[in-house]
């Protein structure tokens, strides 16, 4: 009976949770179509949870197209960050609610807040402005929403998501999630990937900033801009470490920092836990 | 373990009604899309319907649009096919199935005859 | 909307290498499903997205897809290998499609 059933249970290679997918569509291969535009469009990945840039020809393809990565995420990608939503009420804090105030190397003194283990609370410090830890929010409400116990036993989950005691139900909250820090790397890793102007098909690899990986692109032999990479490993050291964003659950994340206003709505958009 | 078990199936006249279900377990049911799925004896598989997991939007075969309507009650983890205005050609054994956006369907239960004759 | 077209049956002496395939227009532009049904058993999914694998499926099953055709490779084959397959798609307005089946023969 086991054996059969253990047939029946389908666990991808890279242990991926349920998909909870906010349209079927988002599940389609993108499609390029048959015609020989180069536009650049996004897809969501159904293997890696993200949303990723792909060529599009211009006409047919399907609807797993989408003109900005931002809408591509309001499509496909709500309720697929594998979100740890709190089932008890006494759940634990994200592992970087007990790591020490980190003022970092950097000689700026901004105002941030961190969770204090000792007393329980969110407090003030200042911080350099660049490295430290993840225990590091721009508001003290911020702080409180992902490390502190909520009042009458709620508990916040990293998502603004807010599980009721009394039937379990979930309250959206408009809550931030932890801000962005700041690129260090060579300028040309938030550069596009360009083709160039010639024929040839060279595999070569691009640092793709908005979801912080290397990725392949075909360059045509000539032309296009310093973000081009004969290897993954030469992409990832050239640009990799340059990028460092905070997540609320399961470590660091590269992405490239966008304009103080647009902060908050990226920073919840592109999270994804790492252990996806 | 994760488990589908479909029920209802059973005999009924051309022009009548049957409503099937299928109990999930094992999975949190409502984070899946859910499909019916049919075969005709000696035949192949032939896809009736699908809901989704969030939207709980339905789509439908052709074959049956108009007639059959599927829905899910996340709270009982159970999935339903109403069939309505049977027909000679929807017998079949019908399966429900735990399905990936529309892809794949990777749980499937063992299955419920529905016999339609006069 | 896709057809998909199988072969209906396929014949492989034991230990050889079994390939069914599944064509239908465009058929690489989308991902493609295989399953395995033995006699009075429910279907089994034995690939995924073109070519993945379930856990507990065994790894002489591969899939591949291209052009207008999807393959499912069985390497090595084996008599419990015997059953029907069936390939399956979707299409853009959110049908799941399957082909018509292959019946595999272990000789």
């Known amino acids: 009976d086991s054996e059969e059933d253990e047939e029946h249970t389908i666990i991808t290679d890279t242990e991926l949770p349920p998909l909870k997918l906010m349209h079927s569509f988002c599940a389609f291969k993108a499609d390029d179509g048959p015609c020989k535009a180069i536009m650049k469009r996004f897809f969501f990945n159904i293997f890696t949870r993200q949303c990723e840039e792909f060529i599009y020809g211009g006409c047919e393809g399907n609807q797993n197209r989408f003109e900005s990565l931002e809408e591509c995420k309001k499509m496909c990608t709500r309720d697929n960050a594998n979100r740890i939503i709190k089932t008890t009420l006494q759940q634990e804090k994200p592992d970087f609610c007990f790591l020490e105030e980190d003022p970092g190397i950097c000689r700026g003194y901004i105002t941030r807040y961190f969770y204090n283990n000792q007393t329980k609370q969110c407090e003030r410090f200042k911080y350099g402005g660049c490295l430290g830890n993840m225990n590091n929010f721009e508001t003290l409400e911020e702080c409180k929403n992902i490390c502190e116990d909520g009042p009458n036993g709620f508990q916040v989950d990293n998502y603004g998501t807010q599980l009721n005691a009394v039937n379990n139900s979930l309250t959206p909250q408009s809550t931030k999630v932890p801000s962005l820090f700041e690129f260090h790397g060579p300028s040309w890793c938030l550069t596009p990937a360009d083709r160039g102007l010639c024929r040839a098909n060279e595999n070569r690899f691009y640092y793709n900033s908005v979801i912080g990986k290397c990725r392949p692109f075909k360059y045509s032999g000539c032309g296009g801009n310093e973000n081009n990479f004969t290897s993954k490993q030469e992409c990832l050291r050239a640009c990799k470490k340059g990028f460092i964003q905070r997540i609320s659950k399961g470590g660091l994340i590269k992405t490239k920092r966008k304009r103080k206003k647009q902060r908050v709505k990226i920073a919840y958009e592109e999270i994804f836990v790492k252990n996806m | 373990q994760v488990q589908l078990v479909e029920s209802g199936g059973g005999l009924v006249q051309p022009g009548g009604s049957l409503r099937l279900s299928c109990a999930a377990s094992g999975f949190t049911f409502n984070d899946y899309a859910m499909s019916w799925v049919r075969q005709a004896p000696g035949k192949g598989l032939e896809w009736v319907s699908l809901i989704e997991s969030v939207s709980s939007s339905t789509y439908y075969a052709d074959s049956v649009k108009g007639r059959f309507t599927i829905s899910r009650d996340n709270s009982k983890n159970t999935l339903y096919l109403q069939m309505n205005s049977l027909r000679a050609e929807d017998t079949a054994v019908y399966y429900c199935a735990r399905t990936i956006g529309v892809l794949w369907d990777d749980v499937w239960g063992q299955g419920t005859l529905v016999t339609v004759s006069s | 909307d896709i057809e998909l077209t199988q072969p209906p049956s396929v014949s492989v002496a034991p230990g050889q290498t079994a390939r069914i395939s599944c064509s239908g227009d465009?058929?690489?532009?989308?991902?493609v499903s295989w399953y395995q049904q033995k006699p009075g058993q429910a279907p089994v999914l034995v690939i995924y997205?073109?070519?993945k694998r379930p856990s507990g499926i065994p790894e002489r099953f591969s899939g591949s897809n291209s052009g207008n055709t999807a393959t499912l490779t069985i390497s090595g084959t084996q008599a419990e290998d015997e059953a029907d397959y069936y390939c399956?798609?979707?299409?853009?307005?959110?049908?799941?499609?399957f082909g018509g089946g292959t019946k595999l023969t272990v000789l």
């Open positions: 399956q798609s979707y299409t853009y307005s959110l049908n799941q499609v």
């Open positions: 465009a058929l690489g532009s989308k991902y």
């Open positions: 997205g073109d070519n």
